[in-house]
Interface confidence: low
């Protein structure tokens, strides 16, 4: 029978080899078969399975003249890029007469240094607080030990001693670095390093020392901020419009705040030119050489009602017989607060000063007992918030009222919270 | 060869959870990493996050944290992904992969409508 | 996260021409192990992405030699040296060196 058909003698004379290495490396696979008559396809197989789209070449050289001579057949995969979906039992599969041959295995495995699959980032902490850093390797070969680097110094005697994929560091006082180095049989991976910068703690305990219509004092107590020394603090204020309204926490304003620095120490700033009875919003950030650090919530606080800080205007007295129109306008200076109401004063030559509070009306009708003949008489007119009473006018001298002078426009109203007065 | 073989295609209400499957073959299971990518129609990859089932870490982008849980069963060699009080934002192709994107599943699609 | 801006958004092309796709990275790619982990990805109508490069030029293989990736730190290049009707798709440039992985937006290849 022709060479290679029967059962028990195998036509390869060469067999696969084993390839093992890293990602990324070319490698070949060769099988080499003698065969007499007409050379057959040589298949792949990996795993039992055949290579539909190996990357395979074949080469035939004959023995002889004549094309039943024998034949030496080389088949060669290329593995252009060891993947891991690469690795695996390797054979040649051809098919003679009525049956197929299968060439001894070989293998291919992917085995190289450790890789990466985490590594530590950079990123920023506050002074003496805990945080965690990852990182993760892998083989083949396993197993991938870790070991933790700070400032390039070893955390651990050896690798797979101490912490592996989490390290927990409890809190650091000035900025460092940290590395992880992946070790298995066939060497060491060192990860990129991470630099963890230390910034200042937050501020603590905003608070409100003082507050003036126009003026708020606050005050802070700093957080730790490591080896190094605070430079300065930043505080920021914002109005509280009530349609926008800061929330608490919420990372930044929503419109440009006013933003001031306070050297340090003292932890305290006085804030000016502000409006009186004004709700703000202030938060605080402490910064050192590394950075700043993160704000507080804003604060609430709110500057307390002022007095007006004028008095009203266009004020009009004219008498009649035996009653007096007094009206007046809100006054044109800043309220520094809400307009509780007005007082009114007047007073004859030798008579003493009359209080009254008008409330919240810019008019009021005198009734004046008597014959009226009471001389040189004079009005004043202030405005008060909750913190006190405005400036008073300057006196207005009560004019008699004469046919043809125009009466005042606005509907007069008669005074009754408070009793008639008369003159001796 | 490898293959990833994702679930069928999803339809849910607004605010339920659906768990989506990827099953591997050909290759060990526990060596490599499954990764999770979203497509919204028309538009590109977003990655969700990776599941190593050897340790069970999942490693997540932080837009999808509290959206997807990645989880992986060693037995059938299956990794899960549960997404969370869903909206019509979630509607989408959701892929499987390996670590690096040599190897993809189909794609599951998932539509979110009342 | 690591911005991926790839031009141009779409690109048409005539059979048997070259064509080229840019991608830029916010952040350099180079990581500390001297390895840049940059991918190209193809995505066929209805059909999931493939993988045709890694490792910024290497070819995955069965991937034409026509390709060809290269660049470095954030600057990289995919082009194919004679387009053929197989190569339509959007190709999406992948990032792996930072965390977490980020994709570029996507070049629709279209043929004239």
């Known amino acids: 029978a022709p060479r290679g058909t029967q059962a028990e003698e195998s036509p390869f004379v060469g067999n696969p080899g084993n390839i093992t290495g890293a990602r990324g490396l070319t490698g070949t696979l060769r099988c080499q078969l003698q065969v007499q008559g007409e050379p057959p396809e040589v298949h792949w197989l990996r795993d039992g399975q055949i290579l539909e789209l190996a990357d395979s070449t074949q080469t035939q050289v004959p023995l002889g003249e004549d094309e039943q001579d024998d034949w030496i057949v080389v088949s060669q995969l290329r593995i252009a890029s060891l993947q891991l979906s690469d690795a695996g039992q390797y054979q040649c599969l051809v098919f003679l007469g009525h049956q197929n041959f299968v060439s001894q295995p070989g293998y291919v495995g992917l085995e190289g240094l450790p890789y990466f699959l985490e590594e530590p980032e950079d990123r920023t902490v506050a002074a003496n607080t805990p945080f965690n850093l990852s990182c993760q390797a892998q083989g083949p070969p396993e197993p991938v030990d870790l070991l933790w680097l700070q400032d390039a110094v070893p955390l651990a005697t050896a690798p797979g001693h101490g912490p592996q994929r989490n390290l927990h560091v409890p809190g650091l006082n000035k900025t460092s670095s940290f590395s992880c180095e992946a070790h298995n049989a066939k060497g060491v991976t060192t990860s990129r390093t991470a630099t963890i910068t230390v910034l200042p703690q937050q501020p603590r305990n905003l608070h409100l020392v003082s507050r003036q219509p126009t003026e708020l004092e606050v005050a802070w107590t700093p957080g730790l901020s490591g080896i190094y020394p605070l430079t300065h603090c930043t505080l920021q204020a914002m109005l509280s419009d009530n349609e926008v309204g800061i929330q608490a926490g919420e990372p930044d304003p929503p419109e440009e705040p006013l933003t001031l620095q306070a050297s340090v120490p003292p932890h305290q700033l006085r804030l000016g030119s502000l409006h009186p009875h004004t709700p703000y919003h202030i938060r605080v950030a402490c910064t050192s050489s590394q950075g700043l650090s993160s704000w507080t919530h804003w604060l609430p606080v709110e500057t307390p009602e002022g007095v007006p800080l004028g008095p009203p205007e266009n004020i009009s007295a004219t008498r009649n017989g035996s009653q007096a129109f007094v009206h007046w306008q809100e006054p044109r200076a800043p309220l520094q607060g809400t307009l509780l109401g007005y007082r009114l004063a007047y007073q004859g030559q030798d008579t003493p000063e009359v209080l009254m509070d008008i409330g919240l009306r810019q008019e009021v009708t005198l009734e004046l007992q008597g014959d009226g003949s009471v001389s040189n008489l004079t009005v004043c007119v202030a405005a008060y918030t909750a913190a006190g009473d405005g400036p008073w006018s300057l006196p207005v001298p009560l004019e008699a009222w004469r046919p043809g002078q125009a009466q005042p426009v606005h509907q007069l109203v008669k005074e009754t919270s408070a009793p008639a007065f008369s003159w001796p | 060869q490898v293959q990833l073989q994702q679930s069928g295609a999803e339809l849910a209400r607004p605010g339920a959870s659906v768990k989506l499957s990827c099953k591997a073959s050909?290759?060990?299971?526990?060596?490599?990493?499954i990764s999770w990518v979203k497509q919204r129609t028309g538009q590109g990859l977003e990655w969700i996050g990776e599941?190593?089932?050897?340790?069970?870490?999942?490693y997540y982008n932080e837009k999808f944290k509290g959206k997807a849980t990645l989880t992986a069963d060693k037995s059938s060699s299956t990794a899960y992904m549960e997404l969370r009080s869903l909206t019509s934002e979630d509607s989408a192709v959701y892929f499987c992969?390996?670590?690096?994107?040599?190897?993809w599943g189909q794609g599951t699609t998932l539509t979110v409508s009342s | 996260d690591v911005v991926m801006t790839q031009t141009p958004l779409t690109l048409s092309v005539t059979i048997g021409q070259p064509a080229s796709i840019s991608c830029k990275s916010s952040?350099?790619?180079?990581?500390?192990?001297?390895?840049?982990?940059l991918n190209w990805l193809l995505q066929r109508p209805g059909q999931s992405p493939k993988r045709l490069i890694y490792?910024?030029?290497k070819l995955d293989s069965g991937v034409p030699d026509r390709f060809t990736g290269s660049g470095s730190g954030t600057d990289f290049t995919l082009k194919i040296s004679r387009v053929e009707a197989e190569d339509l798709g959007v190709y999406y440039c992948?990032?792996?060196?930072?965390?977490?992985?980020?994709f570029g937006g996507g070049t629709k290849l279209e043929i004239k």
């Open positions: 992969a390996s670590p690096l994107f040599d190897y």
């Open positions: 050909g290759y060990t299971f526990t060596s490599y990493g």
């Open positions: 599941i190593y089932p050897r340790s069970g870490n999942a």
């Open positions: 952040q350099s790619l180079l990581d500390s192990d001297g390895k840049t982990y």
């Open positions: 490792l910024v030029s």
């Open positions: 992948w990032q792996g060196t930072h965390f977490p992985q980020t």
